[in-house]
């Protein structure tokens, strides 16, 4: 069952899930002058068995010029640092992760994605809440959500997470420093 | 050239039903998500439904969960929007709206639509 909403925002935090859990999909998005192949689904799902969880589908993105072509371009210099260092990112997130069963991991990133990345969770998932790079957390209890399902109808839990400037004052003295930056995490989590 | 063009709107009253029909043509693209949106005078553009062509996903608003039905017609490039149980919050201007790919709902969803109606009126009375 699909969450109906999108996790709850908090303002100037981010959040992320360590693992998706099947039935979980992602949308196939490009990034500007590309786009999905003509045959391409709009969706990745994650699927699997008792044993073992993967994405079903593969995102290909070709360029919106080309005609009935599947030619990928290659990125820019810049472009490729870029996606270098999101793809360490990646590595390093995965590295960390225990693997869950009935679960995904984040699916690696294609040629010409966008920035932004569209999940539709399912019932049961968490996601898990950092304040961006300036902020502080200030905790009152898990900087977490989860989907869950109430009388028939999805929501998502209200994660315990306040994030101050590090210029202002703490409301919660003696609150740890938060322990890691969220640069690694996709755009398309963040809170505004 | 993309067309969207909404019809079926106009006055109900409270409690009332409506449907709302639209008919794209042009759309360059296989696999796409039409959606609805809605602006009341003075508020912001406000999602309503969407879903994609395979009926895959199908997402809807807070505001209209368990009133409103987002569905496809017999034609593949044709979507209705079923109003139930009207309100006179329901009031607004409602447009319809297409993406290249998945469906993409919430708050901050209509700027990833690329194709919008010109938008048709659903007035609630009490």
């Known amino acids: 069952e699909l969450c109906d909403d999108d996790p709850p925002k908090i303002t100037h935090a981010t959040f992320k899930a360590v693992a998706y859990k099947e039935g979980t999909m992602l949308n196939c998005e490009c990034k500007r002058g590309f786009r999905r192949i003509k045959s391409g689904s709009p969706y990745m799902l994650c699927t699997g068995n008792s044993s073992h969880s993967s994405w079903d589908n593969q995102c290909q993105c070709t360029s919106s010029a080309a005609r009935n072509t599947t030619k990928q371009v290659t990125p820019q210099p810049e472009e490729q640092k870029e996606r270098k260092t999101t793809e360490m990112q990646s590595q390093m997130q995965l590295a960390d992760q225990v693997s869950l069963p009935g679960h995904c991991r984040e699916p690696p990133p294609w040629e010409n994605e966008a920035t932004e990345r569209i999940y539709h969770f399912v019932v049961g998932q968490t996601v898990y809440y950092q304040c961006v790079q300036g902020y502080r957390a200030l905790h009152r209890g898990p900087a977490e959500s989860v989907c869950k399902m109430t009388h028939g109808k999805t929501r998502w839990t209200q994660p315990q997470l306040i994030c101050t400037g590090e210029t202002e004052p703490s409301q919660f003295p003696g609150e740890e420093e938060p322990q890691a930056s969220p640069d690694g995490l996709p755009e398309s989590e963040t809170s505004r | 050239q993309v067309q969207l063009v909404e019809s079926g709107g106009g006055l109900v009253q409270a409690g009332g039903s409506l449907r709302l029909s639209c008919a794209a043509s042009?759309?360059?693209?296989?696999?796409?998500?039409m959606g609805w949106f809605r602006q009341a005078p003075g508020k912001e553009r406000e999602f309503v439904a969407a879903?994609?062509?395979?009926?895959?996903?199908?997402r809807y608003g807070d505001s209209v969960k368990g009133r409103f039905t987002i569905s496809r017609g017999n034609a593949k490039n044709t979507v209705f929007l079923q109003m139930n149980s009207l309100k006179p919050e329901d009031t607004a201007v409602y447009y319809c709206?297409?993406?290249?790919?998945?469906?993409?709902?919430?708050?901050?969803?209509?700027?990833?639509?690329?194709?919008w109606g010109q938008g048709t009126q659903v007035t609630v009375s009490s």
């Open positions: 042009g759309i360059p693209f296989d696999n796409y998500a």
């Open positions: 879903r994609d062509l395979e009926g895959i996903i199908t």
């Open positions: 709206a297409a993406r290249d790919g998945g469906v993409v709902a919430g708050s901050r969803s209509s700027a990833q639509y690329n194709y």
